[in-house]
């Protein structure tokens, strides 16, 4: 970890470090790293792990320093911590470091897994949960069903996974999921492998997502960051023709805001 010369925590308390518009962004986005001290400071530094000197620094005359990173590249991603200095602290003395901030600059988030709990075979009258699991917290997860153009269910989760409940009678089918950052600028994951849910007595089969006909590929999330369940028109697939909106039946549910979470 970083080891700038720091006094006891109670003496020079740690600052707060945040990123705007998000900690996960695509390359080329402008990112502001914002460091706020609990008292006026004259210099802020951003440290990388293991470094005793700041990678970036900025002189200020207030409690806040903003580092404007223009058109970020993946190389600018990584773990940052912030410290601040005051002129009366003596040479080389920095505050306690902030909590870590991980900036991820990527075109696409890693593919999630999709598993059935307790398993992909459904008994009579039993419900099943599908867990879409990524690697990042505070993401929005979307579940698709083959043959249904619109997202089947939509969940925001503080955990790196989201659970979608399927009612037993409607559960069998072929499913896929993906996740994305909850607000603009959106970064999308690859879509998971498909998962086949079957009745007891019919063996489940796994197929790559790309071979699942009629299943919508994920496009950009809703333009309104406040919307938790986008309409079909918000999900414009890349390189695929948008299917027409199907009639509102239980098999083709288009969850539009405000979000509700019916079982299928």
């Amino acid at each position: 970890d970083i080891t700038p010369s720091v006094p006891p925590a109670s003496y020079h308390p740690k600052p707060w470090l945040g990123a705007q518009p998000a900690t996960v962004v695509t390359p080329g986005v402008n990112v502001t790293l914002r460091c706020r001290a609990p008292q006026p400071a004259w210099r802020f530094g951003l440290f990388k792990p293991g470094e005793i000197a700041p990678l970036l620094f900025r002189d200020v005359s207030s409690e806040l320093a903003e580092f404007f990173l223009e058109e970020v590249t993946p190389a600018q991603g990584g773990i940052y911590r912030c410290c601040y200095r005051r002129p009366d602290w003596g040479p080389g003395v920095w505050s306690q470091p902030s909590d870590v901030l991980e900036l991820l600059v990527t075109e696409e988030l890693p593919r999630p897994s999709l598993v059935a709990l307790p398993g992909p075979v459904v008994g009579p009258g039993a419900n099943v949960s599908l867990r879409c699991a990524g690697r990042l917290r505070n993401m929005s997860f979307v579940l698709y069903r083959e043959g249904v153009a619109a997202p089947l269910q939509y969940r925001h989760s503080a955990q790196p996974w989201a659970d979608f409940t399927l009612l037993g009678a409607r559960a069998p089918g072929t499913y896929s999921c993906y996740y994305h950052t909850p607000s603009a600028p959106y970064v999308l994951s690859q879509r998971s492998e498909v998962l086949v849910i079957s009745w007891e007595g019919e063996g489940p089969e796994a197929r790559p997502a790309s071979s699942a006909p009629g299943m919508q590929a994920p496009g950009p999330p809703p333009s309104d960051p406040g919307a938790q369940a986008p309409s079909l028109s918000s999900f414009r697939p890349r390189g695929l023709v948008l299917q027409p909106l199907l009639p509102q039946t239980q098999d083709s549910w288009d969850p539009a805001p405000p979000p509700s979470d019916p079982g299928v």
Epitope: L46, L56, R58, D59, V60, S61, F67, F68, P91, G92
Partner: antibody
């Protein structure tokens, strides 16, 4: 390309005031502090102070408090230094300089101020 | 204020010669040090920042080293266009302060 274009030479009388400008281009003006430096004839350099164009926050070298006032016009990406109650001691070349987050300074071409009656 | 003592104040050197200029700070400046070159009638130009980082476009014959209170600028093989005045600048503490300068002339 980062450029800091300063205003032309000034010849002013003692007791008067002057405003030196520094127009920035090639980067986002509000992202970096602008510093001002004095170089008297044949001498080394002295820091005057800096301004944060984003919020107008300033810090002055104690020696120049009351002598220099730093301002910015964000709409034109221009920093200004106002010098008042001029005496012959203020005759010098004044530079604006941008400091990036890594510690690299970019310099304007300088403005020569001559205070003479 | 931090005092920067630069030496020598002036020197003559031959083309191709290795030249070293030193700067001593009155306290630890944590490598927040730049080396500047100034030619007559021109503005300063930053050569080195953070003690040892070469500015893009500056010839690789220039290098900086040092830590704590002691720093140096080295020109590995002097060229004609290197003549001018060189300043060290500390920006560890405000107000930033400069060394008195080293006037480098060609023999």
């Amino acid at each position: 390309e980062i450029q800091l274009q300063q205003s032309g030479p000034e010849l002013v009388k003692p007791g008067a005031s002057v405003k030196v400008s520094c127009k920035a281009s090639g980067y986002v003006f509000t992202s970096y502090n602008m510093y001002w430096v004095k170089q008297s004839h044949g001498k080394s350099l002295e820091w005057i102070g800096y301004i944060d164009p984003y919020n107008g926050g300033t810090r002055y070298n104690q020696k120049f408090k009351g002598k220099a006032t730093l301002t910015v016009d964000k709409s034109s990406s221009t920093a200004y230094m106002h010098l008042n109650s001029l005496t012959s001691e203020d005759s010098a070349v004044y530079y604006c300089a941008r400091l990036d987050y890594y510690g690299n300074f970019y310099w304007g071409q300088g403005t020569t101020l001559t205070v003479s009656s | 204020d931090i005092k920067m003592t630069q030496s020598p104040s002036s020197m003559y050197a031959s083309l191709g010669e290795r030249v070293t200029i030193t700067c001593k700070a009155s306290q630890d400046i944590n490598s927040f040090l730049s080396w500047l070159q100034q030619k007559p009638g021109k503005s300063p130009k930053t050569l080195i920042y953070r003690a040892n980082r070469l500015v893009d476009g500056v010839p690789s014959r220039f290098s900086g080293s040092g830590s704590g209170q002691d720093y140096s600028l080295t020109i590995s093989s002097l060229e004609y266009e290197d003549m001018g005045i060189y300043y060290c600048l500390q920006y560890d503490d405000f107000p930033y302060t400069f060394g008195g300068g080293t006037k480098l002339e060609i023999k």
